[in-house]
C-alpha cells in the first residue's frame, strides 16, 4: 500500500549529467531502510508505457545509470524509481523533462602542457563521449556541439593574466621568463547552450635558459 | 482504477480568491504529471498549466501566470490550483487531467462562477 | 503560441456515413526525436469531461472503437468517423503538445443528419 507520504520513503529522484553519461540517482526517505528495494522505469516524452531498466530491478543501490537507454539527443526523457520497503509499502517518484543536451554538464578537458624556454604549450585532446554516430562510433564533445570552444587562461602572476582562446586544439603562450612557473586553466566553453566545463589546471614551469651557461 | 476527481468550485467575486483541488485515486500521483485545464461556458479548452507531482516543477500558459499558481500534497495523493484576483472572464468549467504531453485521465471539473 | 484551427465548426452526417474533421496549425508539429506529429484528439459529449481519442496524430487511445482513425502531418490533421453512430454526437477537438503552452482547436461540432 502507499506511504502516507511518497517522501518517507523516496526523494530527490533526479538524473546527474555529465558528458552525457547519464546517472539517475535518488536518496531514501526518512523511513528507508537498507532493505529497501528500488526498481527503475523510463520512457520517452509523449509514450504511454514506462519500460523497465534491466539491471535496475529490486535494487538496493541508489543510483542506476541509463546512458544508453537516454542516449537520443533531441529526446525528452523521464525516469521513476518505484521503491519498496521490507514491511511492502511503496512509493513512486519521477525525475523532471530531461533532456541531455540542455542537462548535461562538462567535465574538465583532457589537456597535455608542454613546458619550452621561453613558452608554453597546451594541446587540447578531444573529449569523446558515450553517443554514437549513425555509424557506430563515438562522438566526442566537438562533434556534438559545433559552436565548442576552448578558453585558456595563463596566470603569469597576481596581476596579470595570458589568455588564448579558438576551436583549434594546440595553443602557445609566447614571451615567457625562463626558470618560472605559471599557472594554466583551460575551459571549454559552449555558448549556444551556456554552458562552461569546470577548469582544468597545470602548474607548469619554463625550462631554464641553458644558452647563457 | 484512475480516478480523478475536483472539488472547491463555486460562487466568488471579481477580485477574490478560490483553491481547487483534485483528488487522485487508483494511482500514485508522483507517478505521472498533472495539468490544469479549463472551458468556459459553451468555449473550448484552454490549458493553463502542469505540475510534475515529484518535484513540484511547473510549467504555465504565459496568460496565467501570477495569478494561477498550482501544487501538490503529495501525502494527499491531491493536485491544487490557487487562484487570485479572479475576474468574470475567469468563470469556467476547471479540470484535472494527467499525462505529460496529452491527457488519457480527465477529472469530471468543478464549475467556477466569478460574479458580483 | 501554436494555434490550432478546426474546420468546419459543426458538421451533419447521416448515420453509418464517413465524418471528417480538418486541423490545422500554425507551425509544424513534427517531433524530430521520433518523426512523430504532437496531436492528439478529443471527444466531449455534454455534461462530460473530453475523452482522449488519438494521440501521435494516428495512435488510437485503448478501448476507442476502430471506426475512429486520425491522419495527417505537418501542420494539417485529419479526425475521420468512418461509419458515424448515435453515441458519436460530440464535439471534437484537436490539441498540439508540441511546445508550450499546449493549445486545442476550438471545436467541431458532430450531429445526425
Known amino acids: 500500500h502507499a506511504p502516507e507520504d511518497p517522501s518517507d520513503l523516496l526523494q530527490h529522484v533526479k538524473f546527474q549529467s555529465s558528458n552525457f553519461e547519464n546517472i539517475l540517482t535518488w536518496d531514501s526517505g526518512p523511513e528507508g531502510t537498507p532493505d529497501t528495494v528500488y526498481s527503475i522505469e523510463y520512457k520517452t516524452y509523449g509514450e504511454r508505457d514506462w519500460v523497465a531498466k534491466k539491471g535496475c530491478q529490486r535494487i538496493t543501490r541508489k543510483s542506476c545509470n541509463l546512458t544508453v537507454e537516454t542516449g537520443n539527443l533531441t529526446e525528452l526523457y523521464y525516469a521513476r524509481v518505484t521503491a519498496v520497503s521490507a514491511g511492502g509499502r511503496s512509493a513512486t517518484k519521477m525525475t523532471d523533462r530531461f533532456s541531455s543536451l540542455q542537462h548535461t554538464t562538462l567535465k574538465p578537458p583532457d589537456v597535455t602542457c608542454i613546458s619550452k624556454v621561453r613558452s608554453i604549450q597546451m594541446i587540447v585532446h578531444p573529449t569523446p563521449t558515450p553517443i554514437r554516430a549513425g555509424d557506430g562510433h563515438r562522438l566526442t564533445l566537438e562533434d556534438i556541439f559545433h559552436d565548442l570552444f576552448y578558453h585558456l587562461e595563463l596566470q603569469v602572476n597576481r596581476t596579470y593574466q595570458m589568455h588564448l582562446g579558438g576551436k583549434q586544439r594546440e595553443y602557445e603562450f609566447f614571451g615567457l621568463t625562463p626558470d618560472t612557473e605559471f599557472l594554466g586553466t583551460i575551459m571549454i566553453c559552449v555558448p549556444t547552450w551556456a554552458k562552461e566545463s569546470a577548469p582544468y589546471m597545470c602548474r607548469v614551469k619554463t625550462l631554464p635558459d641553458r644558452t647563457w651557461t | 482504477e484512475v480516478q480523478l476527481v475536483e472539488s472547491g468550485g463555486g460562487l466568488v467575486q471579481p477580485g477574490g480568491s478560490l483553491r481547487l483541488s483534485c483528488a487522485a485515486s487508483?494511482?500514485?500521483?508522483?507517478?505521472?504529471?498533472m495539468n490544469w485545464v479549463r472551458q468556459a461556458p459553451g468555449k473550448g479548452l484552454e490549458w493553463i498549466g502542469e505540475?510534475?507531482?515529484?518535484?513540484?516543477?511547473?510549467t504555465y500558459n504565459q496568460k496565467f501566470k501570477g495569478r494561477f499558481t498550482i501544487s501538490v500534497d503529495q501525502s494527499k495523493n491531491t493536485a491544487y490550483l490557487q487562484m487570485n484576483s479572479l475576474r468574470a472572464e475567469d468563470t469556467a468549467v476547471y479540470y484535472c487531467?494527467?499525462?505529460?504531453?496529452?491527457?488519457?485521465?480527465w477529472g469530471q471539473g468543478t464549475l467556477v462562477t466569478v460574479s458580483s | 503560441d501554436i494555434v490550432m484551427t478546426q474546420s468546419p465548426d459543426s458538421l451533419a452526417v447521416s448515420l453509418g456515413e464517413r465524418a471528417t474533421i480538418n486541423c490545422k496549425s500554425s507551425?509544424?508539429?513534427?517531433?524530430?526525436?521520433?518523426?512523430?506529429?504532437?496531436l492528439a484528439w478529443y471527444q466531449q459529449k455534454p455534461g462530460q469531461p473530453p475523452k482522449l481519442l488519438i494521440y501521435?496524430?494516428?495512435s488510437r487511445e485503448s478501448g476507442v472503437p476502430d471506426r475512429f482513425s486520425g491522419s495527417g502531418s505537418g501542420t494539417d490533421f485529419t479526425l475521420t468517423i468512418s461509419s458515424l453512430q448515435a453515441e458519436d454526437v460530440a464535439v471534437y477537438y484537436c490539441?498540439?503538445?508540441?511546445?508550450?503552452?499546449?493549445?486545442f482547436g476550438q471545436g467541431t461540432k458532430v450531429e445526425i443528419k
Open positions: 487508483g494511482y500514485s500521483i508522483t507517478a505521472e504529471y
Open positions: 505540475i510534475n507531482p515529484s518535484t513540484g516543477t511547473t
Open positions: 507551425q509544424s508539429l513534427l517531433y524530430s526525436s521520433n518523426q512523430k506529429n504532437c
Open positions: 487531467a494527467r499525462f505529460d504531453a496529452y491527457f488519457d485521465y
Open positions: 490539441q498540439q503538445y508540441y511546445s508550450y503552452p499546449f493549445t
Open positions: 501521435w496524430a494516428s
